[in-house]
């Protein structure tokens, strides 16, 4: 079982390989000096049907380096960064993992593209392995709350409350959504 020639790349090179390309072979892409690699640099020859070989993902692309490009902080609710830090320049990558009791959908890594957007795929999502969710928490008088997403919230996520200036927060500042679908505490109040 073998794979066909790896997909070509403009303004870059493909690592050495011999033919036939055996299942298990890895080929790696790199870009010329003034270009930046967007996407996974390593492709793996696999077989899905034990008959034909295929590459496990699309080839990355080489974008002409844009020194003015910068990307915003990428947010994945229920997830956290395991690699990458601000500022995010053209060609920089960020890799995510999901919090406990969350599973990932999509690709764990994204790259800062010349158009100031993360790509070449969408940001991954972290989905709660528990079907239960906590109901949306109310806003509080003279205060605010921040949550990682709107509406009902998956277990493992939290909401942080704060009070307007001149008001004191009474109760729990951070309330966690438990795996039972219940909140760890009642909302606090803001008192003068």
């Amino acid at each position: 079982i073998s794979c066909g020639s790896p997909p070509p790349i403009l303004n870059g090179r493909i690592s050495y390989y011999s033919t036939p390309i055996a299942v298990g072979t890895v080929i790696r892409y790199s870009c010329s000096g003034t270009f930046r690699l967007i996407g996974e640099k390593s492709l793996l020859c696999i077989t899905k049907d034990k008959v034909d070989g295929t590459w496990d993902k699309p080839a990355p692309k080489c974008e002409y380096f844009n020194k003015y490009s910068s990307c915003p902080e990428p947010i994945v609710p229920g997830g956290y960064k395991i690699r990458g830090s601000t500022p995010y320049r053209h060609g920089d990558s960020v890799t995510f993992a999901c919090k406990t009791n969350f599973s990932m959908n999509g690709n764990k890594s994204v790259w800062c593209q010349a158009n100031n957007m993360w790509g070449p795929t969408r940001l991954p999502t972290c989905v709660s392995v528990f079907p239960l969710e906590c109901p949306a928490l109310p806003m509080i008088h003279n205060g605010h709350h921040t949550s990682e997403n709107v509406g009902s919230i998956a277990p493992g996520l939290s909401v942080t409350y704060s009070c307007e200036s001149g008001y004191l927060l009474v109760g729990e500042k951070i309330i966690n959504c438990l795996s039972s679908g219940k909140w760890s505490a009642v909302p606090p109040t803001c008192e003068e």
Partner: antibody
Framework: QVQLVQSGAEVKKPGSSVKVSCKAS????????ISWVRQAPGQGLEWMGR????????NYAQKFQGRVTITADKSTSTAYMELSSLRSEDTAVYYC????????????WGQGTLVTVSS | DIVMTQSPATLSVSPGERATLSCRAG??????LAWYQQKPGQAPRLLIY???SRATGIPARFSGSGSGTEFTLTISSLQSEDFAVYYC????????FGQGTKLEIK
């Protein structure tokens, strides 16, 4: 950090086989490749082959083709390396080493297993 | 197979000084090169990957450079714990290691 724990030292007769295990803990066994690298006494490092457990795909260095078999048991997060038709020059420390995804370099290594081939 | 050649075989340097280790590939390997440190009785430890990226927890005194066929590992100010054997490894086409450079105290 992933920890790789290998089986203990072995003494074997020429012509026999040896099977060394490497148990991984921490991380996701399915998200990495395990290579086997050996080091003869006072010598350098020599790559023997590697397996991608999630796919069950194993590839071997030409020198060891037909004599080495690398397998993995996903249920126990354990990789195995079996070397057959042993000869005295196979006396070495055998290491398992982990590469994240298919990065090509080894972030974590087992402690090594000394295999002595002697009549 | 891609043959990796390290030089010198042995390097004698005084603590506090700079050490420069070389690795040459038999054909272009782009930047697909890693450096490892090995002390007696221990497994190798990853220092540098992709020719110049420091692995997690590796001190800043270790740096890597080069691309194509010529690569260098530099240790800017040698500490006592740095005296060991250093190996380069390519991953352009499968995997192969250099024969090692022994860094010893002068």
């Amino acid at each position: 950090q992933v920890q790789l724990v290998q089986s203990g030292a072995e003494v074997k007769k020429p012509g026999s086989s040896v099977k060394v295990s490497c148990k991984a803990s921490g991380g996701t066994f399915s998200s990495y490749a395990i290579s086997w690298v050996r080091q003869a006494p006072g010598q350098g490092l020599e790559w023997m082959g590697r397996i991608i457990p999630i796919l069950g795909i194993a590839n071997y260095a030409q020198k060891f083709q037909g004599r080495v078999t690398i397998t993995a048991d996903k249920s126990t997060s354990t990789a195995y390396m079996e070397l057959s038709s042993l000869r005295s020059e196979d006396t070495a420390v055998y290491y398992c080493a982990r590469e994240e995804d298919i990065s090509g370099y080894y972030q974590d290594w087992g402690q090594g297993t000394l295999v002595t081939v002697s009549s | 197979d891609i043959v990796m050649t390290q030089s010198p075989a042995t390097l004698s340097v005084s603590p506090g000084e700079r050490a420069t280790l070389s690795c040459r590939a038999g054909q272009s390997i782009s930047s697909y090169l890693a450096w490892y440190q090995q002390k007696p009785g221990q497994a190798p430890r990853l220092l540098i990957y992709d020719a110049s990226s420091r692995a997690t927890g590796i001190p800043a005194r270790f740096s890597g450079s080069g691309s194509g066929t010529e690569f260098t590992l530099t240790i800017s100010s040698l500490q006592s714990e740095d005296f060991a054997v250093y190996y380069c490894q390519q991953y352009e086409y499968w995997y192969s290691f250099g024969q090692g450079t022994k860094l010893e105290i002068k």
